[in-house]
C-alpha cells in the first residue's frame, strides 16, 4: 500500500525541524506540529509523515526529486522523495543528491576529484515521461568540472538550479540545461497546465522570483484557453 | 504571510458526507501545494490528503482512499476535502496546511510552513 512505501521512507524523506516561516499567535496560522528529526542514534516523532506531492522536480526541495513512491504506481501520485546518494540507482540527474549527477543509472559524484580535466556527460531528456530513460533524445554535452566550485553564470552549463549563481536557474536550452535568470515582475513565464507539460519545452523558462507568482496577465482573461498570456505578478 | 482558515466541520451521521474548505488570504497560493491532516482526542496529528501546486497530483492516507478527495481551486485560493461515507473513527479535528514552494525557494526540503486553527468533525454512529 501506499502508505506503508510512505512510512518505510518517512525517516529518509522528512525534513529537519522548522525555522522561521511559522504563523504569529492569534493569527490563523501556527507552525508546523511536528516532524520526524534526527537526534543522535533515534528519530523522535513529534508527528507523523507529511507527504508533499509535486508534478514535477522544481516543486520539491534540492536535497528531494519528484516521483511516483511505488514502483510503476499511480502516475497521479507523485511525492517530493529523498534524493539518492552516491552509487545509488537512478534515472535522471534530480533524483542524485548536489554534488551528484545520474551516469548510466547510478548517482556519481561531480567533484574535482572524480574528473579528468572535462567529462562527457549525457542530458537525456524524455518527452511524456520524466522518469524514463529508453525513449528519450540522448545529446552528448561537455561539462567543465569547474561549474561544480564557482556558481554558473548565465549561459553555463548546468544540473540543477543550486549549480547556478543567485538570481539562475537551470533550465533546459535546446538538449542541455543552462543557468538562466530567474523571472522578474512582468516578465512572460510558464503555467503548466497538465502533468509532464514541462518535458516538452526545448526553452525552459526559469520560475517567477521571490514574491511573484506566476498568473494570467489579467488583460488576457477574455482570451482563450490556449492563448491566455501568463506573467509573473505580486502575490 | 499566509493565512489559512478550515470551514464545513459539523456533526454528521455515520455515512454521511461533509464539505472541508480552507480559504488563503494574505499571499496568493498557486504555488503551493496543499494538505489536510487531522487529530483526534488523545493522538497524533496524522496525514489525510494532499495536493500539489498545480492540482495534478494527489496522495490519501489509505484509510481515507476511495471515501475522501481533495481537490483546489486557484482562482478562489481555496482546497477542499470532499468527506464520504464517513466513520465514527474519522471524529477529529481537521487541520489545512500550505507547504512552500520547494527548491525554486531555496529549500533542501519541501515542507508545510502554515498552518490553520482546525475545524471539528463529529461522526456519530
Known amino acids: 500500500t501506499l502508505n506503508s512505501v510512505l512510512n518505510s521512507n518517512a525517516i529518509k524523506n522528512l525534513p529537519p525541524p522548522l525555522g522561521g516561516a511559522a504563523g504569529h499567535p492569534g493569527s490563523a496560522v501556527s507552525a508546523a506540529p511536528g516532524i520526524l528529526y534526527p537526534g543522535g542514534n533515534k528519530y523522535q516523532t513529534i508527528d507523523n509523515y507529511q507527504p508533499y506531492p509535486c508534478a514535477e522536480d522544481e516543486e520539491c526541495g534540492t536535497d528531494e526529486y519528484c516521483a511516483s513512491p511505488t514502483r510503476g504506481g499511480d502516475a497521479g501520485v507523485q511525492i517530493c522523495l529523498a534524493c539518492r546518494k552516491r552509487r545509488k540507482r537512478c534515472m535522471r540527474h534530480a533524483m542524485c543528491c548536489p554534488g551528484n549527477y545520474c551516469k548510466n543509472g547510478i548517482c556519481v559524484s561531480s567533484d574535482q576529484n572524480h574528473f579528468r580535466g572535462e567529462i562527457e556527460e549525457t542530458i537525456t531528456e524524455s518527452f511524456g515521461n520524466d522518469h524514463s530513460t529508453l525513449d528519450g533524445y540522448s545529446r552528448r554535452t561537455t561539462l567543465s568540472s569547474k561549474m561544480y566550485h564557482t556558481k554558473g553564470q548565465e549561459g553555463s552549463v548546468c544540473l540543477r538550479s543550486s549549480d547556478c549563481a543567485s538570481g539562475l536557474c537551470c533550465a533546459r536550452h535546446f538538449w542541455s540545461k543552462i543557468c538562466k535568470p530567474v523571472l522578474k515582475e512582468g516578465q512572460v513565464c510558464t503555467k503548466h497546465r497538465r502533468k509532464g507539460s514541462h518535458g516538452l519545452e526545448i526553452f525552459q523558462r526559469c520560475y517567477c522570483g521571490e514574491g511573484l507568482s506566476c498568473r494570467i496577465q489579467k488583460d488576457h482573461h477574455q482570451a482563450s484557453n490556449s492563448s491566455r498570456l501568463h506573467t509573473c505578478q505580486r502575490h | 504571510e499566509v493565512q489559512l482558515v478550515e470551514s464545513g466541520g459539523g456533526l454528521v451521521q455515520a455515512g454521511g458526507s461533509l464539505r472541508l474548505s480552507c480559504a488563503a488570504s494574505g499571499r496568493t497560493f498557486s504555488s503551493y501545494a496543499m494538505g489536510w491532516f487531522r487529530q483526534a482526542p488523545g493522538k497524533e496529528r496524522e496525514f489525510v490528503a494532499a495536493?500539489?501546486?498545480?492540482?495534478?497530483?494527489?496522495v490519501y492516507a489509505d484509510s481515507v482512499k476511495g471515501r475522501f478527495a481533495i481537490s483546489r481551486d486557484n482562482a478562489k485560493n481555496t482546497v477542499y476535502l470532499q468527506m464520504n461515507s464517513l466513520k465514527p473513527e474519522d471524529t477529529a479535528v481537521y487541520y489545512c496546511?500550505?507547504?512552500?514552494?520547494?527548491?525554486?525557494?531555496?529549500?533542501?526540503?519541501?515542507?508545510?510552513?502554515?498552518w490553520g486553527q482546525g475545524t471539528q468533525v463529529t461522526v456519530s454512529s
Open positions: 495536493i500539489s501546486s498545480s492540482g495534478s497530483s494527489t
Open positions: 496546511a500550505a507547504g512552500n514552494g520547494g527548491r525554486n525557494y531555496g529549500h533542501s526540503r519541501a515542507r508545510y510552513d502554515y
